[in-house]
Interface confidence: low
């Protein structure tokens, strides 16, 4: 599924991530404009053998298990399949865990290079919240 | 339960492709790897690549790049994979397997056969 | 590539035998080395995963062992529905490679 800007705010707000750690809802969509576009089946193999999953491309190698990334931790404990529904309750869910990891955001390069210190709530303009 | 039936056996000649099907059943096509795997009389089981019926993406082995490319479509739950540019060394038998990083589901294979 | 040389490539036995099949690895791949059965004319069918993870269905004759690059799969007392080629795979990193195979054969 391939959300739009304002569908993916109200799904996320409706899964609590508004403010979640101190983050705001536009970090949140900002983040999955620059790692999925948007996009819940996006998938992108890194150098070392694992893959990023889903709107927010969560890493094989710490935080899911695909049964293909060697030293896998999933200490999300999920199936990486799960992070590719276009019900995002596992992605969200598995972002908590993240988020509080002790990085914050800056687990997202995407966040880091394309949002973090920009005008973050313009993600969430205008829509009906 | 998890099935994936194969095309049936091909004959064909030297230079032309051919396009071998694999439609899966008993689960959600989308959320798994989609493996190719070729063999052939003495030379064992050989990687050909796989893709991510859901998203498209796909990764080849080095050595079937230009030979071989994928192609999924989740509205029939079918994976394809095309063979181009056919040659005697191309006669194998082809598997689909589900993608596990092992692979405990396989299609019953496609013999290709390349002949002038 | 990762480089899996399996020995014997052939093991003639007599039903009720115990039998080793040896699968080493050029380089270490953890436990990430799997094995298939597959008799003529037939798909290769998944034994062990993870190096000593039976799977489900798959008699209790048959276990895995080994960790970085040297794996063995034993059949404790072989049945003559156990003779056919037998492949260990890796899948610790990419291209997926696979064992030349041992074939098992009666004596």
């Known amino acids: 599924k391939v959300f739009g800007r304002c569908e993916l705010a109200a799904a996320m707000k409706r899964h609590g991530l508004d403010n979640y750690r101190g983050y705001s809802l536009g970090n949140w969509v900002c983040a999955a404009k620059f790692e999925s576009n948007f996009n819940t089946q996006a998938t992108n193999r890194n150098t070392d053998g694992s893959t990023d999953y889903g709107i927010l491309q969560i890493n094989s190698r710490w935080w899911c298990n695909d049964g293909r990334t060697p030293g896998s931790r999933n200490l999300c404990n999920i199936p990486c399949s799960a992070l590719l529904s276009s019900d995002i309750t596992a992605s969200v869910n598995c972002a908590k865990k993240i988020v509080s990891d002790g990085n914050g955001m800056n687990a997202w390069v995407a966040w880091r290079n394309r949002c973090k210190g920009t005008d973050v709530q313009a993600w969430i303009r205008g829509c009906r919240l | 339960q998890v099935q994936l039936q194969e095309s049936g056996a091909e004959v064909m000649k030297p230079g032309a492709s051919v396009k071998i099907s694999c439609k899966a059943t008993?689960?959600?096509?989308?959320?798994?790897?989609i493996e190719w795997v070729k063999q052939r009389p003495g030379h064992g089981l050989e990687w050909i690549g796989e893709?991510?019926?859901?998203?498209?993406?796909?990764y080849y082995n080095e050595k079937f790049k230009g030979k071989a490319t994928f192609t999924a479509d989740t509205s029939s739950n079918t994976a394809y994979m095309q063979l181009s540019s056919l040659t005697s060394e191309d006669s194998a038998v082809y598997y689909c397997?589900?993608?596990?990083?092992?692979?405990?589901?396989w299609g019953q294979g496609t013999t290709l056969t390349v002949s002038s | 590539d990762i480089e899996l040389t399996q020995s014997p490539a052939t093991l003639s036995v007599t039903p009720g035998d115990s039998v080793s099949l040896s699968c080493r690895a050029s380089?270490?791949?953890?436990?990430?080395l799997h094995w298939y059965q597959q008799k003529p004319h037939e798909s290769p069918r998944l034994l062990i995963k993870y190096a000593s993870q039976r799977v489900s269905g798959i008699p209790s004759r048959f276990s895995g062992s080994g960790s970085g690059t040297d794996f063995t799969l034993s059949i404790n007392s072989v049945e003559t529905e156990d003779f056919g080629m037998y492949f260990c795979q890796q899948s610790n990193s990419w291209p997926r490679t696979f064992g030349g195979g041992t074939k098992l054969e009666i004596k």
């Open positions: 893709i991510l019926p859901g998203s498209g993406s796909t």
């Open positions: 008993g689960y959600t096509f989308t959320t798994y790897w």
């Open positions: 397997a589900r993608g596990d990083g092992h692979y405990c589901y």
């Open positions: 380089q270490s791949i953890s436990n990430n």
